[in-house]
Interface confidence: low
Amino acid sequence: KKVVLGKKGDTVELTCTASQKKSIQFHWKNSNQIKILGNQGSFLTKGPSKLNDRADSRRSLWDQGNFPLIIKNLKIEDSDTYICEVEDQKEEVQLLVFGLTANSDTHLLQGQSLTLTLESPPGSSPSVQCRSPRGKNIQGGKTLSVSQLELQDSGTWTCTVLQNQKKVEFKIDIVVLAFQKASSIVYKKEGEQVEFSFPLAFTVEKLTGSGELWWQAERASSSKSWITFDLKNKEVSVKRVTQDPKLQMGKKLPLHLTLPQALPQYAGSGNLTLALEAKTGKLHQEVNLVVMRATQLQKNLTCEVWGPTSPKLMLSLKLENKEAKVSKREKAVWVLNPEAGMWQCLLSDSGQVLLESNIKVLPTWSTPVQP
């Protein structure tokens, strides 16, 4: 008995071939001997089976002695043995229809679980193997679960169902909803405008939800909500914004925030959360702001940074085109009685300059100029 595997919702074509290469009488029946379809001369006739509207054949092939049964929009319950009667002989084909679905929405938040459920006909014992977009293989029976979805799990999952040495392949598109970066850091000199960007790692046309940026300034004892906003389709509308600092927000995606100026009191870290409509849980992105200030007070030239710096970052003060006068793994460095000229304050990581501020030291009778 020939075995054919089909996919729920698809179309299958069961073949039946006569030895005579001409149009002769044929019938397709199911295992209950109920006629599905056949011919009367050049006409297609249909029987009382439940397949009625979904069953068809290819009249163009009858003259070649081919009498296929086409079943459209396959259902699991179409799984059966189909019998083709032609030339006093019977050809039996066993059709097994499988369905594979994500038992939740195919748009899932990062960290959530994905469960794939296999629908199969009674009596079948299929095995399933799925390959994620990043090449990870998972195997299972009727259900497969993947916990803690990551950004790289976004894309097409290819699942192969194996039964009677035959296989059928399913493709399921999974979208992991997340920000492109889990964390970002912005380095700014005092007084500069600050741009924060929160690009999403997915594109869906209809994106509705609400969000908030909570900020923990290094100098503050508690965190504070800086801005709340709504998202409707690709449109962002600000609900509430603090007066100090007065953030500005772009009206379209990607989410974009502008801080009018960097100040030591703003240095710290923030957490932008985005709650999407019809989704449990929230998307998160951490953002950090490091602010640098160089000042000269009387005979003391000082450079300071505020915000979440790593212990390996180096802060240096040097006279332009000269060796560093002072270099420390600290958040403040200073030089007493600095000589006149253009001084540079540098924040660097393994030799790479992250932030630079220049201050001009004038001869002792003048006041300093900050460019």
Epitope: Q180, T203, E205, K206, K232, N233, K234, E235, P254
Partner: antibody
Framework: QVQLVQSGAEVKKPGASVKVSCKAS????????IHWVRQATGQGLEWIGE????????YSNSKFKDRVTITADKSTNTAYMELRSLRSDDTAVYFC???????????WGQGTLVTVSS | DIVLTQSPASLAVSPGQRATITCKAG??????????MNWYQQKPGQPPKLLIY???NLESGIPSRFSGSGSGTDFTLTINPVEENDTATYYC?????????FGPGTKVEIK
């Protein structure tokens, strides 16, 4: 399949208004932005503006800001582009378009020729 | 506004040869690793047809003879090999910021 079908050609006098329609089918109308683009005979393409059919929020090219109104009727899956105070240099084929999966306009209406002549 | 310039204005290529069209943007159209530049083909009396989106992604159903490259402000559309029915005008378009803008077009003729 996705289809955008536009209204027929129009002949207008200078100073008049024209309203071109674009009927969408084959997808959920409120899910996608409808854009309007025009092309004068033998010339290049010029973006007029866009509408979010779900919210009715419209954005237009500042060049047309005072003269263009883009609207959408969710009940009929139709977007409209109205251009007022027509001038002879508004003579062009007006297209509606929709994004595909990427950022480009993958689906276009057949175009509506608007002729402005005294 | 971002202005796009295309070169050459017109181009005559023999079948089987390579055609290269460039598009220059007045400012960078890059955002977070993606370049928001698209390419279209337009034949007389027809609406434009999307060939390439986000600088290098081939639109579904478009032959692999068409390819796009570039980032920042400089982009290229390549047709290799050119076929008879590639006679058309080709436009670049930025979808980085409003107002969205198209290049002036490059007319490609098959010799």
């Amino acid at each position: 399949q996705v289809q955008l079908v536009q209204s027929g050609a129009e002949v207008k006098k200078p100073g008049a208004s024209v309203k071109v329609s674009c009927k969408a089918s084959g997808y959920t109308f409120t899910d996608y932005v409808i854009h309007w683009v025009r092309q004068a005979t033998g010339q290049g393409l010029e973006w007029i503006g866009e509408i979010y059919p779900g919210s009715g929020s419209a954005y237009s090219n500042s060049k047309f800001k005072d003269r263009v109104t883009i609207t959408a009727d969710k009940s009929t899956n139709t977007a409209y582009m109205e251009l007022r105070s027509l001038r002879s240099d508004d003579t062009a084929v007006y297209f509606c378009a929709r994004r595909g999966n990427g950022t480009g306009f993958a689906y276009w209406g057949q175009g509506t020729l608007v002729t402005v002549s005294s | 506004d971002i202005v796009l310039t295309q070169s050459p204005a017109s181009l005559a290529v023999s079948p089987g040869q390579r055609a290269t069209i460039t598009c220059k943007a007045g400012q960078s159209v890059d955002y977070d690793g993606d370049s928001y530049m698209n390419w279209y083909q337009q034949k007389p009396g027809q609406p434009p047809k999307l060939l390439i989106y986000v600088a290098s992604n081939l639109e579904s159903g478009i032959p692999s003879r068409f390819s796009g490259s570039g980032s920042g402000t400089d982009f290229t559309l390549t047709i290799n090999p050119v076929e008879e029915n590639d006679t058309a005008t080709y436009y670049c378009q930025q979808s980085y910021k409003d107002p969205l803008a198209f290049g002036p077009g490059t007319k490609v003729e098959i010799k």
